[in-house]
Interface confidence: medium
């Protein structure tokens, strides 16, 4: 004979759990139906009647099969430094993520609670580690033979040009100036060599993360504005 299918509510066998999409109600001491995502329990089950479910109201949701008496409130609207990547519906909460040029300084279950602008490395400093969705840019001083003359959250230190005759030697924040008409590029130690026209001055290629002997300039202060780190600017 086939096993008899129990209809909710029913008393579970000792030591057994309720079936999928059911829960054990402590008060009724019965296995009862859960409400589907987008719904909540309007009336809890009893020994003789099953859970009565109702749809979530506007701006509320349930993402899981549940038996909560009220749906959860969707989060507040996304702030100006955020993008809404998932709208509030009856089955899912609103998700806000940081817009380009910003990173998440304080995350929550899904999305971001607090965004902060990516650090910009000032001239003489280049990007040692690029920013990600959840971490800030790390700046490092440009090593000898390399420079950065920009204030940027993406530019790395680039090698000085090699001159036949040097008019002005390069430093950490300025390229060498040549009197010769045919400068070449050096392969300075620690520099990323990227073939490009000499006139190009802005390099947006993401660098390969490397250990730096310079002190880390990345620190996180989600509670209020932070002073600019060494080699960075808040602009």
């Amino acid at each position: 004979l086939p096993a008899q299918v129990a209809f909710t509510p029913y008393a579970p066998e000792p030591g057994s759990t309720c079936r999928l999409r059911e829960y054990y109600d402590q008060t009724a001491q019965m296995c009862c139906s859960k409400c589907s995502p987008g719904q909540h329990a309007k009336v809890f089950c009893t020994k003789t009647s099953d859970t009565v479910c109702d749809s979530c109201e506007d701006s509320t949701y349930t993402q899981l099969w549940n038996w909560v008496p009220e749906c959860l409130s969707c989060g507040s609207r996304c702030s100006s430094d955020q993008v809404e990547t998932q709208a509030c519906t009856r089955e899912q909460n609103r998700i806000c993520t940081c817009r380009p040029g910003w990173y998440c300084a304080l995350s929550k279950q899904e999305g971001c609670r607090l965004c902060a602008p990516l650090r910009k490395c000032r001239p003489g400093f280049g990007v040692a580690r690029p920013g990600t969705e959840t971490s800030d840019v790390v700046c490092k001083p440009c090593a000898p033979g390399t420079f950065s003359n920009t204030t940027s959250s993406t530019d790395i230190c680039r090698p000085h040009q090699i001159c036949n005759v040097v008019a002005i030697p390069g430093n950490a924040s300025m390229d060498a100036v040549c009197t010769s008409t045919s400068p070449t590029r050096s392969m300075a130690p620690g520099a990323v060599h990227l073939p490009q026209p000499v006139s190009t001055r802005s390099q947006h290629t993401q660098p390969t993360p490397e250990p730096s002997t310079a002190p880390s300039t990345s620190f996180l202060l989600p509670m209020g504005p932070s002073p600019p780190a060494e080699g960075s600017t808040g602009d």
Epitope: T17, C18, E22, Y23, Y24, D25, Q26, T27, C32, K34, F44, T62, Q63, L64, W65, N66, W67, V68, L72, Q109
Partner: nanobody
Framework: ELQLVESGGGLVQPGGSLTLSCAAS????????IGWFREAPGKEREGVSC????????NYADSVKGRFTISRDNAKNTVYLQMNSLKPEDTGVYHC?????????????????WGQGTQVTVSS
């Protein structure tokens, strides 16, 4: 679906201590409350304590307040029940169980997943 595995039970003398662990796994775990209930022969199933995995809010049955402490380690997806000043009436099989979005308004109303349980015996 969630999986819950309890450990840490044993035999202890009255006045002694034990710490139970509940290792949880599954999707959306942060949306759940994890609670403990106990079963003893001839007694009704009794809710002991629960904790919200996201907010960390906790609740306790009157019978264990001041003696039991529930805590969570979200990195390990584990909930702990530290039981001090144990009494013979604390004897039973302790199960950890889950409830979506629960625990803010008292002990778990119900459970949708629960583990096999771990035996706690308080006896001299």
């Amino acid at each position: 679906e969630l999986q819950l595995v309890e450990s840490g039970g044993g035999l202890v003398q009255p006045g002694g201590s034990l710490t139970l662990s509940c290792a949880a796994s599954g999707r959306f775990l942060e949306y759940y409350a994890i609670g403990w209930f106990r079963e003893a022969p001839g007694k009704e199933r009794e809710g002991v304590s629960c904790i919200s995995m996201s907010a960390g809010s906790t609740n306790y049955a009157d019978s264990v307040k001041g003696r039991f402490t529930i805590s969570r380690d979200n990195a390990k997806n584990t909930v702990y029940l530290q039981m001090n000043s144990l009494k013979p009436e604390d004897t039973g099989v302790y199960h950890c169980a889950s409830e979506p979005y629960g625990c803010d308004d008292g002990l778990l109303r119900g459970y949708d997943y629960w583990g096999q349980g771990t035996q706690v015996t308080v006896s001299s």
